[in-house]
Structures are given as C-alpha cells and as structure tokens.
C-alpha cells in the first residue's frame, strides 16, 4: 500500500549523511517504472533540502542533523509518477517527528531573584518563587523537566538551612525558625535548576531574601534616670529630652517612639512629645509649676512604639526628677479686679478703699503701691498701705470718664525683689448717685403763633438717677406767668408751655423753674419766638425783629 507510518528521527544525529530513513514504495512499480519525489517544508520549500528522496528507489534521505527546538515535526508529501510523468498514486502524507535529546541546560529567567519575608514567621511561610526554563521536551521526556534545589545559604545563621524550595514549582519557603532582621537582614541563596527531573544538567542563580522588620524589639530608655531643673511658672518650657534605643528599622512605625507619663503628674503639669528626627521624648511644661506649692516632681514615663508589638515585650520606664526653681514672682492683687461702691462728690481727702496685693513668694517682701491709670485724676494711693483716697470730685455724670456708673482705675504693686516685679489690679468704682443735677427742658428755643397757638411740649431731662429725677414740677418765674402757663404731664417727664395772652411778633424770654423728686431746682430761660400766624408754625413768616 502507498502509506508510511510516522517516522521518528532523533535530533542532533551524527550521520553519516545522507542518512536513509524509510523507503517509499508503490505497488504500481510491478507494472511500470516509478519515479519518486517529495514536496513540502524541509524538502522543496524552506528549509529546503533537509530531506530528499532517491528518485528510483524511493529511499527517504536525511541530509543533515535536525534540531527539535527549531522544528519538532515535518509534514511532507510523497509523490509517485510513471516514466511519462503521469501520477500513479495520490500524494502521500509523510510525518517526520524529531525526537528530543537533552541538548539544552535549564536557564533561570533572572540572574538574581529578590524576595522578602517578615522576621519571626513560622516555618512553611512562602517567600518567593524562582523560575527556570528548559527548551528541551518536558512532555514526552524528562529532558526539559526542571527540579529546583538550594545549593547554599549565606549567612548560615542561626541555622544552615533557613529555607527550602519546592522541587517542581520553585517556591522558596521558610523551613527553620529564627529569622531575625536585627541579626541577619538579608540571606543570599544559591539556587540550582537541574533538568532530567534533577538528574541532568544544572544551572545556578541567586535568590536574595530580604528579612522585613516586625516590631519585635521594645524601645529602651538610655539612660533610665534623669534630673532636670525648671523655673517656676514657665509654660511650654523644655524640661528634659529622653533618649531611647530601638533595634527595629529606623524611621519605621516599629522604631518611632510613643511616650506616656505613667505617674507623678497629678496636676497635669507636663506633656511629652516625640521628636520626629531623633525619636527623643521632649518633656515640657503644660502649666506653670509652683515652687511654693511643690518644689520637686518625680515623673515616670513609659515608652512604646507607634506600631503594636508583635509579641509580649517588657516596656521600658524612665524616672525624671524635676526640681522647681524659685523665681521672684509678681505681687498679685486680691482680687485682681475690685469693685467698690462710693458716693459721687465725696470731699477731697475722703478714703475710698484699701486695695492690696499678695506676693506668692515665701520671703516677706515689701510691696509698694501706686496708681497706674486714673483718667480723670480723681484718686491718690498710699504707697505703703494701698489706701485709695479722693483728690478730685468724683462725678458720676462725667460721660468722658464714667461708663455705666463705673469709673475704672488701674493700680500697680511692686515688690522689692531683685529684680523687682510688678503686678496690676483693676479698681472699679461704682459711683453712687447724689442729687447734684436739676431738671432741664429740651428744647430751649420755641417758635409759636400768637393766634390759636399750639401748646409747646418740652422734654425734661435730669442727669441724676432715680429717685433724683421724675416726677418733676414746673413753675414760671420773673412774671413769665402773665403770658405763659407751664404744666407737667401725668408721667411727670414733660412740661407743656402754652401762650395764654396775645403777644406781638417778637422774641421773648420765658423763665421756667423745674424741680425734681428730690426738690433740686434748676432755672432755665426758654427763648420763645412769637409769630404773627395761626396754629402751628416752625419759622415766622416775613421779617421779624428781636427784642
């Protein structure tokens, strides 16, 4: 029959070439002379001439060594023709399979592989995967089947073999416990890939395993005891810098320190922050310290990390003895702001009050007093006793200096320390009203018609306070009552002025006496302009003459 079984040819054959592979034979050769030929890639098309056929015998010839990794299978066609060139058979498919030889070593995909694993992990933890390829066949033979192994480990600490590798996948895993970044931050593994499933050619590469930091080291105070001196009353004052050492990776959360005052700060006087570069604990005063109340504080500060510890670790504690230094403190007026009620208009030399300061310092310092600000110049202060007396007339109604009945004075106390210090106090004099002002009408100029005149309503004001104000009483004096009437309204806060007799157009003085509830009398002259007109008027029509 005009058929041929697939032909297997090993690659890298040593010849001699041409090498006979198989004979094509048509049973039509009994009847006529047959000529054989082949076509296809490897015969008459690229790569041409790899195969040939003996024209008359039908022997299929291999002309040179094959390379499976280049072409693993050739598909040719065999042809049989008679002498006259007529085809005596259908073209026959010829499959030539190139069988593999182990002619390639494995190749790692990288010269150096890099991976990482957290320190302190359990065995079995995967680290990384390495890969090697082999061009040889791994399906029908072991030629391209790669087995991985670890040849060596550096350093060999704490165990010779800290890692192992999956022989088929190349996955590197931890096999021994004791990975400690602080002792060995990096391992270098020489890895091997061997074909023939571990029995063939070997190639090597390097796997570098970085050991990642875990917070397995506590920060430790160095030193653990501190002594500091702080002036009293200083706020935000740097008391002490506390130094810690931490074996974990610098500038990582496992290294950065967190400080906590554990004890000794009952009054919440201190605060501690972490310096971003040095990692030191900066102890500062949150509030001023008082030498006279407590001249020494013993603080206990604990340090941890920003990151939690991965295992139970003892925390380090520092002791800081803070000595408070005495400073000359300013005298303090008691109270800082003193309210005193005093009657306005008291006689000069009359005592107003005694206003004194206390010195926080324990020494018996002498305090002297003086007035710092007395806008109206109404007061004097005894430098020794702090006695405040009137030297001017206290006037409640003085709107320039008195606001809401209060006259504000600032006083100063100075001790005799070296250097001396001063403190200020505020004296708020609440001026008690006296009936020192009579009522006055508003307005004091009116314009009125001499025919059917409109009543003129004047508001009454009194600078004093009740009860030295309304109800008011009105009385006309100096014969003004001949032409005019003056009546106080029911509420007693306005006076109604009426023209009761005809007056020719002119300007007249109306003498009005007003008295308040305390009978304080005030005479006021009202200038009345009388116009020739009827009813209501604001200005006189036409010319008029004064008189």
């Amino acid at each position: 029959d005009w058929v041929v079984a697939p032909i297997s040819v090993p690659e890298n054959g040593k010849g001699p070439f041409p090498q006979r592979l198989n004979q094509l034979k048509s049973n039509k050769d009994r009847d006529t002379k047959i000529f054989y030929s082949i076509t296809g890639p490897g015969a008459d098309s690229p790569p041409e001439g790899v195969f040939a056929v003996e024209k008359e015998t039908g022997w299929l010839l291999l002309n040179k060594p094959l390379d499976r990794e280049e072409i693993a299978k050739y598909e040719l066609f065999g042809h049989a023709v008679s002498e006259n060139g007529a085809s005596v058979e259908d073209p026959m498919n010829i499959s030539i399979i190139v069988t593999d030889q182990n002619d390639h070593k494995p190749k790692f995909t990288q010269d150096t592989f890099r991976g990482s694993v957290l320190e302190g992990v359990l065995p079995g933890t995967s680290v990384m995967q390495v890969t090697a390829t082999d061009e040889d066949d791994a399906i029908y033979t072991y030629n391209g089947v790669v087995a991985y192994s670890i040849h060596s480990q550096e350093p060999k600490d704490p165990h010779d073999l800290m890692f192992t590798i999956h022989r088929s996948t190349g996955t590197i895993s931890v096999i021994s416990s004791g990975l400690d970044r602080e002792k060995v931050p990096e391992y270098t593994l020489t890895i091997q890939a061997t074909d023939m499933d571990g029995d063939g050619s070997t190639t090597t590469a390097v796997a570098v395993v970085e050991i990642l930091d875990a917070n397995d080291n506590a920060p430790m105070f160095d030193p653990q005891k501190y002594e500091a001196h702080v002036p009293e009353n200083a706020v935000g004052h740097e008391v002490q810098r506390l130094t810690v050492t931490d074996l974990d990776a610098p500038n990582s959360p496992a290294w950065r320190a967190t400080y906590l005052i554990m004890g000794g700060d009952d009054g919440d006087h201190f605060t501690i922050t972490t310096h971003p570069e040095s990692n030191q604990g900066i102890l500062t005063t949150r509030k001023g310290l008082d030498f006279e109340a407590k001249n020494q504080h013993t603080l206990y500060v604990e340090v941890t990390n920003e990151a939690p510890f991965v295992l139970k670790l003892p925390t380090s504690t520092a002791t800081i003895v803070v000595h408070v230094e005495d400073v000359n403190e300013a005298p303090v007026f008691v109270p800082p702001s003193k309210v005193v009620e005093v009657q306005e208009g008291i006689p000069t030399g009359e005592p107003v009050c005694v206003y004194t300061a206390e010195d926080p310092d324990k020494e018996n310092q002498k305090i002297s007093y003086r007035i710092l600000r007395d806008p109206a110049g109404w007061l004097a202060m005894d430098p020794d006793s702090g006695q405040v007396t009137a030297v001017g007339t206290l006037d409640r109604e003085d709107e320039q200096f008195v606001r809401n009945n209060i006259y504000e004075v600032m006083v100063l106390a100075m001790d005799n320390g070296s250097p001396p210090t001063t403190g200020t106090g505020t004296l708020l004099l609440t001026l008690i009203d006296v009936n020192d002002h009579g009522p006055v009408p508003e307005p004091r100029q009116i314009t009125i018609c001499n025919q059917s005149p409109v009543r003129q309503v004047l508001n009454i004001t009194d600078k004093d306070l009740s009860p030295h104000t309304s109800p008011f009483q009105a009385q006309l004096t100096d014969d003004s009552d001949i032409y005019w009437t003056a009546e106080v309204n029911e509420e007693g806060d306005t006076v109604v002025l009426s023209l009761k007799k005809f007056l020719k157009q002119d300007t007249y003085d109306v003498h009005l006496s007003l008295s308040d509830h305390g009978n304080k009398e005030q005479l006021t002259v009202i200038r009345a302009t009388v116009c020739d007109c009827h009813g209501h008027v604001e200005t006189c029509p036409g010319p008029w003459k004064g008189g």
Epitope: S168, S176, G178, L311
Partner: antibody, heavy 117, light 111 residues
Framework: EVQLLESGGGLVQPGGSLRLSCAAS????????MSWVRQAPGKGLEWVSA????????YYADSVKGRFTISRDNSKNTLYLQMNSLRAEDTAVYYC??????????WGQGTMVTVSS | QSALTQPASVSGSPGQSITISCTGT?????????VSWYQQHPGKAPKLILS???KRPSGVSNRFSGSKSGNTASLSISGLQAEDEADYYC???????????FGGGTKLTVL
C-alpha cells in the same frame, strides 16, 4: 544534653482549663519553633499548635482554635499551652517538640490530659 | 484521615527485612526532601530515627534506612529485632500551615 520536660497535665472536667508547661534545656531555645503534638489513646499523632522562635507567630489546628493559646518565655526557656473550654475529645498525651528545620527533635516525655466528668 | 498514607500494620520475623511506605503528594513528599520517620514504643514519646529521607541521627542503628521515589517515601528495617516492635510515623514538610504532615502510623510486629 538536649531535653524537653512537660508538666501540668491532669484530670479536668469538660469546660475546664489547664495550663501545660514545657521546660527546655541544652539548646538555644529562642532559635527554634516549638510545637505541641497530642496523641489520643490508641490513635496517631495530631499536631495541635506551634509558635515561632521569637513568639511573634503562632499556629493552631482547627480543632483547638479559639480555645487553646500557645506562648513562650524565652528568658525562662519555657513553652506553654493554655487550654480552655476543654472537651472529652481533647483527652490525650500532650508532647512538646522542637522543630529542627525539617523534623521534630527532641520530643518531651509527654503529659496526660484527661477530660471527664 | 491522615495527610500521609501508611499501612496500618506490617510484620516480619527476626532477621528479616521489612519496608513501610508513606505516600503523599507532589506538594509534600514529592516536593521536598524533608521526610522524617519516628519510632514510638508503647507508653513512650516518639523518637526521630530518620530525617531528610535517609539521614540517621547519631545513636540510631544502621539497620534503619530510608528512600523516596516520586510522592512515596519508604522506611526499611533490615535484620529485624524484637526491640524494633513499635509504631512508626512518617512526616513531611509542606509549604503553608500546618507546615508538617503526619502519617497515620504503622504498627510493626516482630513475629
């Protein structure tokens, strides 16, 4: 001589607690992962729990997860197993063993834990 | 159900040789050369007799030997002696947690 010595076993009622200890000597304790392996009467070896050399990583079998706690004190060269909410099926001989990097060696002599009412 | 498969029992006469198999997968026995064997006498703790497939710790008789082919490891004991009667457990390293798998154990009887 490399040695492990367990203690703390005994009879306990279901729901009760026990704490096992394993004292190590003769090797650098902190460099080795340690494990607890138990063996129920007439049965095979069952891995219960493990802890890394530093104590930072732990492993528990599903059968004991949430009930048992493994810990170690490297300053005292001692391994512990705190067993809570004990059940009848926890009855076994408990061995501590050091993982040598591919195998367990040495093993302690074992301590018997019996959970029964 | 143990992760590694061992025969429940084997037996042999004094002087004979026996082999105990331990079958795993391509991710444990087949993947790593970290197969170990432990001997346990009744009432005693397990004792390591082979590590890394075939390495004997000091003090272990050379009658014990180990081998591995594919996913199966084997323990061979030659010249059986009465004191060899014990339970034998295999174990293998595997990546992940748990990182060790135990066999179910094989009871060796010396007839």
């Amino acid at each position: 001589e490399v040695q492990l010595l367990e203690s703390g076993g005994g009879l306990v009622q279901p729901g009760g607690s026990l704490r096992l200890s394993c004292a190590a000597s003769g090797f650098t304790f902190s460099s080795y992962a340690m494990s607890w392996v138990r063996q129920a009467p007439g049965k095979g070896l069952e891995w219960v729990s493990a802890i890394s050399g530093s104590g930072g990583s732990t492993y528990y079998a599903d059968s004991v997860k949430g009930r048992f706690t493994i810990s170690r004190d490297n300053s005292k060269n001692t391994l512990y197993l705190q067993m809570n909410s004990l059940r009848a099926e926890d009855t076994a001989v408990y061995y501590c063993a050091s993982w040598g990097g591919g195998w367990f060696d040495p093993w302690g002599q074992g301590t018997m834990v019996t959970v029964s009412s | 159900q143990s992760a590694l498969t061992q025969p429940a029992s084997v037996s042999g006469s004094p002087g004979q040789s026996i082999t105990i198999s331990c079958t795993g997968t391509s991710n444990d026995v087949g993947a790593y050369n970290y197969v170990s064997w432990y001997q346990q006498h009744p009432g005693k703790a397990p004792k390591l007799i082979l590590s890394e497939v075939n390495k004997r710790p000091s003090g272990v008789s050379n009658r014990f030997s180990g081998s591995k082919s594919g996913n199966t490891a084997s323990l061979s004991i030659s010249g059986l002696q009465a004191e060899d009667e014990a339970d034998y457990y295999c174990s293998s390293f595997t990546s992940g947690l748990p990182w060790v798998l135990f066999g179910g154990g094989t009871k060796l009887t010396v007839l």
